[in-house]
């Protein structure tokens, strides 16, 4: 039975040209996390596999950095980065858990400077 829950940063905003950390956290389960996929819409951004390490999609190699932890750092943000991001946690023995984050990339003067997980 799947007892875990995914906690995410929820709706976040960041400044154009800046960086943001996408972070999910799996709680309320003792299941072992064996892989985490990060996606935007239908595009695979990155995978962190317990045995194989990190893989960053070539399309995002210049702007995506692994971590911290199982999170993902997006750099050099543009307004086109606005949208939904998904973390897909592969676990044993529970199965798959999914979390959703909505990122809004704003012009510099509009973004909230205190947004959680935001990198100055």
């Amino acid at each position: 039975m799947m007892t875990g829950t995914i906690e995410t940063t929820g709706n976040i905003s960041a400044e154009k040209g800046g960086s943001i950390i996408l972070q999910c956290h799996l709680s309320s389960t003792t299941a072992q996390v064996t892989q985490v996929n990060w996606e935007q819409q239908d595009q695979l951004l990155a995978i962190c596999n317990a045995d194989l390490g990190w893989h960053i999609s070539p399309s995002f190699k210049d702007r995506v950095a692994p971590g911290p932890g199982l999170g993902l750092t997006l750099q050099s943000l543009t307004v086109n980065d606005t949208g939904e991001y998904f973390c897909i946690y592969h676990t044993y023995p529970d199965g798959t858990y999914t979390g959703r984050i909505f990122l809004e990339v704003l012009e510099s003067s509009v973004a909230e400077h205190g947004a959680r997980f935001q990198i100055p």
Partner: antibody
């Protein structure tokens, strides 16, 4: 449990437009996921055609992009496929399917055979 | 587009046999591969996702492995209900593409 059911004409004339509908039960297509069309010519492999997401975003296979349109009717919890200018090569079993995050397909309709012939 | 090349295209085996099907991607897809089983007149059924993760309810005799460009699907001990056609699919980038299929027949 989500269930998908395709419906539409089984015979379409060459150069006409193929139109199919997928009715989804057990889940609202506006709640989550992407809702896809995948086809399989007789005795051949599978070809992903495109999807409409829960938010209404569409994406199509570039090999079909100029001919394919996927739309939805949220009031009926249905999504539809239109494929224009069909030829005999479009004869296939057409499936609707739900895409899960990670881009695999755990739920499929039973499929409907569409024959293109005059 | 990423091409998925499956081999063999057909295979004859007996109940109890161990069977292996391979799938080669035309570029690195890391672990983004799924495997499906299709019986005549039926829709494909998802067995394995992310190269090695079994769907809930799928018997443990079905397994998948591999990363990068080379992937393997194994049935450890064939059962009568396993005779079907099997497809790999890359879930790495659109357009999502499938292998041409491997037909598993009774010897």
């Amino acid at each position: 449990q989500v269930q998908l059911q395709e419906s539409g004409p089984g015979l379409v004339k060459p150069s006409q437009t193929l139109s199919l509908t997928c009715t989804v039960s057990g889940y609202s297509i506006t709640d989550d996921y992407a809702w896809n069309w995948i086809r399989q010519p007789p005795g051949k492999g599978l070809e992903w055609m495109g999807y409409i997401s829960y938010s209404g975003h569409t994406r199509y296979n570039p090999s079909l992009k100029s001919r394919v349109t996927i739309s939805r009717d949220t009031s009926k919890n249905q999504f539809s496929l239109k494929l224009s200018s069909v030829t005999a090569a479009d004869t296939a079993v057409y499936y609707c399917a739900r895409k899960y995050y990670g881009s695999w397909f755990p739920d499929w309709g039973q499929g409907t055979l569409v024959t293109v012939s005059s | 587009d990423i091409q998925m090349t499956q081999s063999p295209s057909s295979l004859s085996a007996s109940v109890g046999d161990r069977v292996t099907i391979t799938c080669k991607a035309s570029q690195d897809v890391f672990t983004a591969v799924a495997w499906y089983q299709q019986k005549p007149g039926k829709a494909p059924k998802l067995l394995i996702y992310s190269a090695s993760y079994r769907m809930t309810g799928v018997p443990s005799r079905f397994s998948g492995s591999g990363s990068g460009t080379d992937f393997t699907f194994t049935i450890s001990s064939l059962q009568p209900e396993d005779f079907a056609t099997y497809y790999c699919q890359q879930s790495y980038s659109t357009p999502w593409t499938f292998g041409q299929g491997t037909r598993l027949e009774i010897k």
